[in-house]
Interface confidence: medium
């Protein structure tokens, strides 16, 4: 189990928080990036499946955008790598009740931030 | 291993602006886990926090209370530097000016790790 | 903004011996929190960050500890190069980072 903050919740050796408040795309990763966090990156089917699960029927940011005509990046840089479908054709990934979608970055929106656990 | 290598003026006039270059090498500004920070030091203020820019998918500035209305930090990508630029300044901005890189580790921040070789700067007529 | 205070201002302490410095946050800053090392006319150097956690090249005789708003820095077996001033900084969520006033380590 992972050893999470107060408020974050414990997933493979990932915390992640879920916010009650709604923000753009870029101050809702300023927010992560303030919890020494980023937005969240999905690593794997069971992560997607859970964080669908948890955020419940709400809209939430997670770390995914593209620049016009370029692929879609992870906060950190690296390629997505398809490994589910985004829907829409906004510049920044939100999951929603079905799955990815898209929007534009100045919509507001939860958000979802993810952090690896703390190792004591 | 990343370098920093700072360039710029070592005297300003008061009410000018006060700019100050930061080549990286080593490393790219607009890595993803690192964020480029701005720090000054002086005997009457000791060390300072000015500012940071990092890159997350986004460009993003963070400026310290004390300077923000006169500060802009700014990254060039194509020269893989980033710049300092402090407005109106009078001589209470006199200092010895720092660029630095500060990790981003798995999503965790650490210290300030490396360091530019600093830039006396006075402010004076 | 969160204020660092460090203890004491100087500390006088012979070679080999061990030297305890002090660094209390006026609020908490979980475990965001790193020192430094500055000789006269160098920039600082990063010994510990993460509150416990030796930079890159530091030698295991600096060590940190604490969280939330009391930190020490302990140096043991104290060498001649280690006479410096010595420096704290929180980096917390507020990203308004702060440092100590500094203490100056001498020989005694």
């Known amino acids: 189990q992972a050893a999470c903050p107060e408020s974050w919740i414990g997933f493979q050796r990932k915390c992640f928080y879920f916010s009650d408040d709604t923000k753009n795309w870029t101050s809702s990763q300023r927010f992560c990036d303030s919890q020494d966090a980023d937005l969240a990156q999905v690593e794997s089917f069971q992560e997607l499946n859970f964080l669908l699960r948890y955020k419940g029927p709400s809209d939430h940011w997670i770390g995914l955008s593209r620049e016009q005509g370029q692929p879609w990046k992870w906060i950190n840089g690296t390629e997505w790598t398809r490994q589910f479908p985004i829907l829409g054709a906004g510049e920044c990934a939100y999951l929603n009740d079905k799955g990815a979608s898209s929007a534009r970055h100045y919509t507001e929106r939860k958000w979802i931030c993810s952090k690896s656990d703390i190792h004591v | 291993q990343v370098q920093l290598q700072q360039s710029g003026p070592g005297l300003v006039r008061p009410s000018q602006t006060l700019s100050l270059t930061c080549v990286i090498s080593?490393?790219?500004?607009?890595?993803?886990?690192?964020?480029w920070n701005w720090i000054r030091q002086s005997p009457s203020r000791g060390l300072e926090w000015l500012g940071r820019?990092?890159?997350?998918?986004?460009?993003?500035?963070e400026y310290a209370g004390s300077v923000k209305s006169r500060i802009t930090i700014s990254p060039d990508t194509s020269k893989n530097q980033f710049s300092l630029q402090l407005n109106s300044v009078t001589p209470e901005d006199t200092a010895v000016y720092f660029c630095?890189?500060?990790?981003?580790?798995?999503?965790?921040?650490?210290?300030?790790?490396?360091w530019g070789q600093g830039t006396t700067v006075t402010v004076s007529s | 903004d969160v204020v660092m205070t460090q203890s004491p201002a100087t500390l006088s302490v012979s070679p080999g011996e061990r030297a305890t410095l002090s660094c209390r946050a006026s609020?908490?800053?979980?475990?965001?929190l790193a020192w430094y090392q500055q000789k006269p006319g160098q920039a600082p150097r990063l010994l510990i960050y993460?509150?416990?956690s030796r930079a890159t090249g530091i030698p295991d005789r600096f060590s940190g500890s604490g969280s939330g708003t009391d930190f020490t820095l302990t140096i043991n077996r104290l060498e001649p190069e280690d006479f410096a001033v010595y420096y704290c900084?929180?980096?917390?969520?507020?990203?308004?980072?702060?440092f100590g006033q500094g203490t100056k380590l001498e020989i005694k």
């Open positions: 993460g509150a416990s």
């Open positions: 609020q908490s800053v979980s475990s965001n």
């Open positions: 080593g490393d790219s500004v607009s890595s993803g886990s690192a964020a």
């Open positions: 900084q929180q980096y917390g969520s507020s990203s308004m980072y702060t």
């Open positions: 820019t990092y890159y997350r998918a986004k460009w993003y500035n």
């Open positions: 630095t890189r500060q990790d981003k580790d798995n999503t965790r921040y650490s210290g300030l790790g490396v």
